[in-house]
């Protein structure tokens, strides 16, 4: 499992397959934010999930999103994106039983009910970036990023990894 | 396969310049942050600089003892990372090793042979 | 900086031994739940190779024997089952933050 403080250890037998092992190997609970500190909120409507960026008011409670990490083995001669080894990929569950989803079509990420497995639109590669932020790019379709659009999220398509550092990809993991 | 080949390696006299190249072949090379790292002989290992990805241009973080005196570089077109080396001391002489972070940028993931660069009159 | 203070720094073992190496950090390495703990494997003349990455993970091609554990400041590299191709020296190192630095080694030597 990977080191992790404060939070449910997994200790599994890890295979060669594309994402390694079905369980994850290690779970964090966290807030997540903008790169400008806004918050990542969900609010059930109507029987179903909206997801929302918005500035809270102070000592406003934040919400938390259960990352499941994942280890991926990423052979270049299969995927053909010129990326290989190994690399972190991660599930994001507001609440029991909802995963974050990339919905390529639409360019919208949704909260979907669905029992485990899980399909490969709930996976993305996790970044580590600078200024202590991460971004999280579809596995699904490489180069396709969660991101921040008119105070929602939705899947953004860098063009260059220069431009992989835009602020609207990155985003803040905090306990608090 | 994926290589990352370094030369320019060599004698050099105190005071004096090098510039380390290294070739990196069997991955797209533009989606990994690169880093130098050098071992003196006989000694541990020492991250000496990082060349990362950014919006507007590359973010360069280096090791106190080589700040202002070093300089690291990338050309994605040329699939190659660098190493300006100005203002030589005898405590440079190490093997240089260029290394590719694991994509997603975690850890250490690819390492090349190294070049030897030793300083001295 | 974040200091890495590895022991021992130096071991005589024999085939079939059981190894184990610790690394401390001077501070937390930990962030987004993960351990930025990594251990390499360097024979003489060649270059380090990545054993294990956030504390526990195997890098590619690792043989099972090699395992990672701990969390924070305190990490463990064992080695259940020493082999002649074992013998080298190992070395820990965080990716936390720059300046990533290394621990000062620990040669594994034959008894």
């Known amino acids: 499992a990977f080191g992790i403080s404060g939070v449910q250890k997994y200790t599994r037998a890890l295979h060669d397959s594309s994402i390694t092992g079905i369980s994850p190997i290690t779970e964090y609970l966290a807030s997540l934010s903008t790169y400008n500190d806004q918050s990542i909120t969900f609010a059930l409507e109507d029987e179903s999930y909206e997801i929302y960026v918005e500035d809270l008011k102070k000592d406003e409670k934040k919400d938390k999103v259960l990352l499941s990490y994942y280890e991926s083995q990423h052979p270049s001669n299969e995927s053909g994106d010129g990326v290989d080894g190994k690399m972190l990929m991660v599930t994001l569950s507001p609440t029991k039983d909802f995963w974050l989803h990339a919905n390529n079509k639409e360019h919208s990420v949704e909260l979907h009910k669905c029992e485990k497995p899980l399909p490969d639109q709930a996976f993305f590669v996790l970044h580590n970036m600078h200024s202590n932020c991460v971004s999280f790019e579809c596995k699904t379709d490489p180069g396709v990023f969660i991101g921040v659009k008119d105070n929602h999220l939705a899947l953004i398509k860098v063009d260059s990894s220069e431009n992989l550092c835009t602020e609207n990809i990155l985003f803040k993991l905090s306990e608090t | 396969e994926v290589q990352l080949v370094e030369s320019g390696g060599g004698l050099v006299q105190p005071g004096g310049s090098l510039r380390l190249s290294c070739a990196a072949s069997?991955?797209?090379?533009?989606?990994?942050?690169m880093n130098w790292v050098r071992q003196a002989p006989g000694k541990g290992l020492e991250w000496v600089a990082e060349i990362r990805l950014n919006a507007i241009n590359y973010v360069k973080d280096y090791a106190e003892s080589v700040k202002g005196r070093f300089t690291i570089s990338r050309d994605n077109a040329k699939n190659s990372v660098y190493l300006q080396m100005n203002s030589l001391r005898a405590e440079d002489t190490a093997v240089y090793y260029c290394?590719?972070?694991?994509?997603?940028?975690?850890?250490?993931?690819?390492w090349g042979q190294g070049t030897l660069v030793t300083v001295s009159s | 900086d974040i200091q890495m203070t590895q022991s021992p720094s130096s071991l005589s073992a024999s085939v079939g031994d059981r190894v184990t190496i610790t690394c401390r950090a001077s501070?937390?390495?930990?962030?987004?739940?993960?351990?930025?703990m990594n251990w390499f494997q360097q024979k003489p003349g060649k270059a380090p190779k990545l054993l294990i990455y956030?504390?526990?993970n195997q890098g590619s091609g690792v043989p099972s024997r090699f395992s990672g554990s701990g969390s924070g400041t305190d990490f463990t590299l064992t080695i259940s089952s020493l082999q002649p191709e074992d013998f080298a020296t190992y070395y820990c190192q965080h990716s936390k933050e720059v300046p990533y630095t290394f621990g000062q080694g620990t040669k594994v030597e034959i008894k």
């Open positions: 069997g991955f797209t090379f533009n989606k990994f942050w």
């Open positions: 501070e937390s390495v930990d962030r987004y739940g993960i351990s930025f």
């Open positions: 956030a504390a526990s």
């Open positions: 290394i590719r972070r694991n994509y997603g940028n975690w850890f250490f993931e690819i």
